[in-house]
Amino acid sequence: MEDEEPKVNPKLYMCVCEGLSCGNEDHCEGQQCFSSLSVNDGFRVYQKGCFQVYEQGKMTCKTPPSPGQAVECCQGDWCNRNVTARLPTKGKSFPGSQNFHLE
């Protein structure tokens, strides 16, 4: 019987973690890092963290910004350190969005 193919170990990245999901840690490890901004009841909520499984982040990261939410994703250690997600505003067109541009 042939040996099983070795499982490919996905690369894990260290990411800045900010927000309720981080508990009392300021970093996390995952296959992608993200920085997000969402508007809840008129309040801006900034979060940073990890997408643990690549598939988990794939859809979210491909979603174009909307007036209520924006997510920026990256792969690399601490790549979300200096990234702040921005909401689009009406004006210049943004790829995949309806006539919005970044602030």
Partner: antibody, heavy 119, light 112 residues
Framework: QVKLLQSGAALVKPGDSIRMSCKAS????????IHWVKQSHGKSLEWIGY????????NYNEKFKSKATLTVDKSSSTAYMEFCRLTSEDSAIYYC????????????WGQGVMVTVSS | DVVMTQTPVSLPVSLGGQASISCRSS???????????LHWYLQKPGQSPQLLIY???NRFSGVPDRFSGSGSGTDFTLKLSRVEPEDLGDYYC?????????FGSGTKLEIK
């Protein structure tokens, strides 16, 4: 190459405090979390806590919360651990260790600081 | 806290022989990100511990292929084939899935 150079052995009196240092070289200091580990004579290893040199964020083992204080000096790429109210139970070797990326655990260790608490 | 139970405490082996060390955790070491943060270290006499295996089965750079790690969930094993004199020392498992991080109590590998 990566090196963590710790301060020298110390003989201290009960009730005193001690501050030990861990100078990092061979990598970008603010990109790797620094942990501290205690090894009592002839015993296993105990995790004390960590500090994120970039943010200064810390996390402590509950057991050492009132005993240890972790700080860093980014300008000199040095991590520090202060141990207070020393007792004979604190006599041990203390290691600073670097937590590697890509889930590698503690990839580099300092040479250790032997602390002896005795009157 | 997660308790790491390591066995045996002492392991006498013949040079060129095989050795197996077990580490059991009191709860699953599978992290919310799907990874299992179980690592193995060797502490040679008078030295600092050194990383052998990370995340259950990955050899750290420079570690010979005589060392291998396996396991899942709560049950892990470090195997050493063709034991050489430089392999002697204390072996420790460490879990870094849960805070506080916890080590096994150690296994002393010695010549029979």
């Amino acid at each position: 190459q990566v090196k963590l150079l710790q301060s020298g052995a110390a003989l201290v009196k009960p009730g005193d405090s001690i501050r030990m240092s861990c100078k990092a070289s061979g990598y970008t200091f603010t990109d790797y979390i620094i942990h501290w580990v205690k090894q009592s004579h002839g015993k296993s290893l105990e995790w004390i806590g960590y500090i994120n040199p970039y943010s200064g964020g810390t996390n402590y083992n509950e057991k050492f919360k009132s005993k240890a204080t972790l700080t860093v000096d980014k300008s000199s790429s040095t991590a520090y651990m202060e141990f207070c109210r020393l007792t004979s139970e604190d006599s041990a070797i203390y290691y600073c260790v670097r937590r590697g990326h890509d889930g590698t655990g503690f990839d580099y260790w300092g040479q250790g600081v032997m602390v002896t608490v005795s009157s | 806290d997660v308790v790491m139970t390591q066995t045996p405490v002492s392991l006498p082996v013949s040079l060129g022989g095989q050795a197996s060390i077990s580490c059991r955790s009191s709860q699953s070491l599978v992290h919310s990100n799907g990874e299992t943060y179980l690592h193995w270290y060797l502490q040679k006499p008078g030295q600092s511990p050194q990383l052998l295996i990370y995340r259950v089965s990955n050899r750290f750079s420079g570690v010979p292929d005589r060392f291998s790690g396996s396991g899942s969930g709560t049950d892990f094993t470090l195997k050493l084939s063709r034991v050489e004199p430089e392999d002697l020392g204390d072996y420790y498992c460490l879990q870094s899935t849960h805070l506080p991080l916890t080590f096994g109590s150690g296994t002393k590998l010695e010549i029979k």
